[in-house]
């Protein structure tokens, strides 16, 4: 059989490096809490911080939640990646009129257009339906002379996008095609509330954006407005307000006009791995087994892991949870691999069972 | 230093099975895949089956799927590799590797290899 030992003693002696047979190739040996991002890493910059599922690792190195789709009126357009977000757009039939990062904060139905206009452009996700007149020159069909006038701006003139708040945005999926009275009426009754906190109604320059306040006259103090959840960031774009749903998360900070809420972990739990706004992984304040000593206190610890307490000391271990959870065993089992999200590189001594990771997968 | 060390080779008769194992001991480096790779006489080294370990998920070559099975035992810091319906085309020196889920694939790094054991198909 071959020997693979002329190939392997190119990295002999480098314990930055290893020989993968397979691909018959030195390759970089990625330090702890960092993942290869190919199958034989050459260099530093081939190893990355790996995240939760659901984050991505930013721009900023910085393990950042990925948007959700789960409003009615969005679908996912490209999933959450290890290095870039999920990104959702409206649905079919729908347009965005306010836009949020990798998101949209409000979705429109396509309009219809009206009598004596034909589709010059069908709606897409970004864009409402264009609408042109039927012949050339102003056709005596039209419903009104507001939908016939020639544009003085010279646009192309659209027919009024019918508005759908998230709560409601369920109650039609019938496509909205053509011009019938029908269509347009079941798209009348998807309009928000009276008391919904939207701009719909209101004469505003920016689609789904208000002012905060009643501008006085001549007052530059309107602050373009974000939809409920959504915040101002520093760039002026609408981002969605990170949400605290997980059972062991906590509200910190509400989602206010210019700033995200902020969460945190439950009483009885730490962060384990940090995200912005929020924490990626609580863990409960670990226990300590005996014989061993627990670690919570690297962030970037992707998993409670286990070591033999130093020769003559006494393990340092936190008393049990607040909420009185003792957890599954106390006396961790011996596991071969880290899990798939931990960081944590420990010695295995052949005589004593250790365990690698707490999550008993 | 990680040790793997593979076990259960042997002589099998076609559509007979045999159950490899590879023992991990030392120094596992942040590992979370392992895998079985084979390479049979004067032949390439050819990727088998592979384990993520913190998921369970498990991927196997077309060549050998409905016929293996890799499984794990934590308790034990062991690999196993279940191979039924044996054929003569499965001889080959069987090896272990462990190593990294590569982010964003399912392929995986081999940081660590055993030194193999021996699998013979014939009658």
């Known amino acids: 059989f071959p020997q693979d030992r002329p190939f392997e003693d190119t990295c002999h002696g480098n314990p930055s490096h290893y020989y993968d047979k397979a691909v018959r190739r030195c390759c970089y040996r990625c330090p702890m809490g960092l993942f290869p991002t190919q199958q034989c890493p050459q260099r530093p910059t081939d190893c990355r911080k790996q995240c939760e599922p659901d984050y991505y690792l930013d721009e900023a190195d910085r393990c950042t939640a990925c948007v959700t789709c789960s409003r009615d009126d969005l679908v996912e357009k490209t999933p959450c990646a290890w290095n870039s977000s999920r990104v959702c757009e409206c649905r079919p039939g729908m347009f965005c009129s306010t836009s949020a990062v990798n998101s949209c904060a409000r979705c429109f139905f396509h309009s219809v257009c009206p009598a004596g206009m034909i589709v010059k452009f069908p709606g897409t996700a970004q864009k409402n339906t264009v609408c042109e007149p039927a012949s050339p020159g102003v056709s005596p069909a039209c419903a009104s002379p507001e939908n016939c006038k020639e544009p003085s701006s010279g646009t192309i003139p659209q027919a009024k996008p019918t508005p759908v708040s998230p709560a409601t945005s369920s109650a039609s999926t019938m496509p909205v095609r053509g011009g019938t009275r029908l269509a347009q009426e079941a798209a009348s009754k998807l309009t928000r509330a009276p008391d919904s906190p939207s701009s719909v109604g209101r004469p505003s320059s920016d689609p789904g954006l208000s002012p905060t306040q009643p501008c006085p006259e001549g007052s530059g103090d309107c602050r373009k407005q974000c939809e409920p959840d959504y915040y101002l960031d520093e760039a002026g774009r609408c981002t969605a307000c990170v949400s605290c749903s997980r059972d062991d998360l906590v509200e910190k900070t509400p989602c206010a006009w210019n700033s995200s809420r902020t969460c945190e972990c439950r009483p009885g739990m730490i962060c384990a791995t940090s995200a912005t706004n929020s924490c990626a992984r609580c863990v409960p304040y670990p226990i300590c087994a005996a014989e061993t000593v627990t670690k919570p206190q690297d962030m970037a610890e992707k998993d409670t892991t286990f070591e033999a307490p130093p020769l003559g000391t006494q393990p340092d271990c936190n008393p049990t949870p607040e909420n009185g959870e003792a957890p599954a065993s106390t006396s961790p089992t011996q596991s071969l691999l880290v899990d798939s999200q931990a960081s944590k590189t420990l010695p295995i001594p052949t005589s004593a069972p250790v365990a690698l990771s707490s999550t008993g997968k | 230093e990680v040790q793997l060390v593979e076990s259960g080779g042997g002589l099998v008769q076609p559509g007979g099975s045999l159950r490899l194992s590879c023992a991990a001991s030392?120094?596992?480096?942040?590992?979370?895949?392992m895998g079985w790779f084979r390479q049979a006489p004067g032949k390439g080294r050819e990727w088998v089956a592979r384990?993520?370990?913190?998921?369970?998920?498990?991927y196997y070559a077309d060549s050998v799927k409905g016929r293996f099975t890799i499984s794990q035992d934590n308790s034990k810091n062991t690999l196993y590799l279940q191979m039924n319906s044996l054929r003569a085309e499965d001889t080959a020196v069987y090896d272990c590797?462990?190593?990294?889920?590569?982010?964003?694939?399912?392929?995986?790094?081999?940081?660590?290899w055993g030194q193999g054991t021996l699998v013979t198909v014939s009658s």
């Open positions: 590797a462990a190593g990294r889920v590569v982010l964003g694939a399912v392929v995986c790094t081999n940081e660590y």
């Open positions: 030392g120094y596992i480096y942040s590992s979370n895949c």
């Open positions: 384990i993520h370990t913190g998921s369970g998920s498990t």
